[in-house]
């Protein structure tokens, strides 16, 4: 790994809690200033493996709202606009980090949590099992 | 919004920092215990809009390693295995939260940061602009 010298201006930390508990500033810095959040907003409809977006809300989580994709069809949309079952629509999944209030209902104490979310769908060739 | 009564066992917080700075336990709780992380690992190759995965490493960020998808083709793979430029391969992007060390090089002080990552690619019908 890369060793980085510690900044002498870092906040103090007690050994018993370090590095398990850290301080986090919730003023989010958004590095996406040059990106248009709507740039991919219509892909869910234009895709050959279209998907619906479902709102998942949990007040004990930060962010409290996450949008989950679910593929609309088992197959993929062909050039005629029909579902072609020789191909499969599958969700593209990603593990993301969220903050979970711990203890529950605490406004300023969290634990990192890893969750799996479906971001969208893609069209894949099915795995065919041949029978002898 | 949903109002949740505060847990009396919450850690104390000073008003001047609250709720901007919070405590976070970095012992990650993984809610994906029943899921197989390899379940979608071959979609990047089997997709009609295949992608390559690129490692993005930043020791000042948590997680320090993020995998970025880049579509292999402008078009999509057709039934013959050729690239069809009547369709477009496009990245599916998602905004995710990461922790950025702040001040830099501090092991126990972070700021939340929102970044846009490409998770995979999907095949879409192009938007055709007709000229009068």
């Amino acid at each position: 790994g890369i060793t980085i010298p510690r900044n002498p201006g870092c906040p103090n930390s007690e050994d018993k809690n370090f590095p398990r508990t850290v301080m986090v500033n919730l003023n989010i810095h958004n590095r996406n200033t040059n990106t248009n959040p709507k740039r991919s907003s219509d892909y869910y409809n234009r895709s050959t493996s279209p998907w619906n977006l479902h709102r998942n809300e949990d007040p004990e989580r930060y962010p409290s709202v996450i949008w989950e994709a679910k593929c609309r069809h088992l197959g993929c949309i062909n050039a005629d606009g029909n579902v072609d079952y020789h191909m499969n629509s599958v969700p593209i999944q990603q593990e993301i980090l969220v903050l979970r209030r711990e203890p529950p209902h605490c406004p300023n104490s969290f634990r990192l949590e890893k969750i799996l979310v479906s971001v969208g769908c893609t069209c894949v060739t099915p795995i065919v099992h041949h029978v002898a | 919004g949903i109002t949740i009564p505060r847990n009396p066992g919450c850690p104390n917080s000073e008003d001047k920092n609250f709720p901007r700075t919070v405590m976070v336990n970095l012992n990650i709780h993984n809610r994906n215990t029943n899921t197989n992380p390899k379940r979608s690992s071959d979609y990047y190759n089997r997709s009609t809009s295949p992608w390559n995965l690129h490692r993005n490493e930043d020791p000042e960020r948590y997680p320090s390693v993020i995998w970025e998808a880049k579509c292999r083709h402008l078009g999509c793979i057709n039934a013959d295995g050729n690239v069809d430029y009547h369709m477009n391969s496009v990245p599916i992007q998602q905004e995710i939260l990461v922790l950025r060390r702040e001040p830099p090089h501090c092991p126990n002080s972070f700021r939340l940061e929102k970044i846009l990552v490409s998770v995979g690619c999907t095949c879409v019908t192009p938007i055709v602009h007709h000229v009068a």
């Epitope: 619906n52 679910k70 020789h86 | 379940r39």
Partner: antibody
């Protein structure tokens, strides 16, 4: 009115064969995926096989793969299930059902036949 | 293919709410359907796409699906709702998967 009517069930000895038919009416048959689902006496539902519109793509449960063949005749609005090398554990009511979808996504099995009983016994 | 797990039975008093659960690996990332089957009859679709009701299905039937669990809720349960209920989704091989079924008894 959508109707699915199964036929062809009956008593057969282990190792024997049967051909089930499902006559569809009340809707345009050809675009839809059609499926066979079975239910052993006192047991739950088990997906057996599916066939997609043109008939080019077929899928089977592991328990019947290599023994059962699903097919369809779109000109006759009829779905078939050819069952060979039958076993006692294939004893069940066999249902024909339609997998419906629209632009919002798949709606699963919206219409079912009344079922036909297949008994495999010596 | 991953299976779907349902409780074998659920009992409810008339007018009360019955909840039938269905659990499976990452079930919330797929669509779930629910079927009602009364003795000697064919199954009937009561919920599709997690929470939608086909025409003709009473409003007391509702559904949800997130995480690893889909839930069928019958509010203001009536004697006519006594039946077996099956959840269903699809695996990645385009095969339908059914839960083992739950017998809902109205006391």
């Amino acid at each position: 009115e959508v109707q699915l009517l199964e036929s062809g069930g009956g008593l057969v000895q282990p190792g024997g064969s049967l051909r089930l038919s499902c006559a569809a009416s009340g809707f345009t048959f050809s675009p839809y995926m059609m499926v066979w689902v079975r239910q052993a006496p006192g047991k739950g539902l088990e997906w057996v096989s599916g066939i997609y519109s043109s008939g080019g793509a077929t899928y089977y449960a592991d328990s019947v793969k290599g023994r059962f063949t699903i097919s369809r005749d779109n000109s006759k609005n009829t779905l078939y299930l050819q069952m060979n090398s039958l076993r006692a554990e294939d004893t069940a009511v066999y249902y024909c059902t339609r997998h419906y979808y629209d632009s919002s996504g798949y709606l699963s099995f919206d219409y079912w036949g009344q079922g036909t009983l297949v008994t495999v016994s010596s | 293919s991953g299976g779907l797990t349902q409780p074998p039975s659920v009992s409810v008093s008339p007018g009360q709410t019955a909840s039938v659960t269905c659990s499976g690996d990452a079930l919330g990332q797929k669509y779930a359907s629910w079927y009602q089957q009364k003795p000697g009859q064919s199954p009937v679709l009561v919920i599709f796409q997690d929470s939608k009701r086909p025409s003709g299905i009473p409003e007391r039937f509702s559904g949800s699906n997130s995480g690893n669990t889909a839930t069928l809720t019958i509010s203001g349960t009536q004697a006519v709702d006594e039946a077996d209920y099956y959840c269903q989704t699809w695996d990645s091989s385009t095969r339908a998967v059914f839960g083992g079924g739950t017998k809902v008894t109205v006391l």
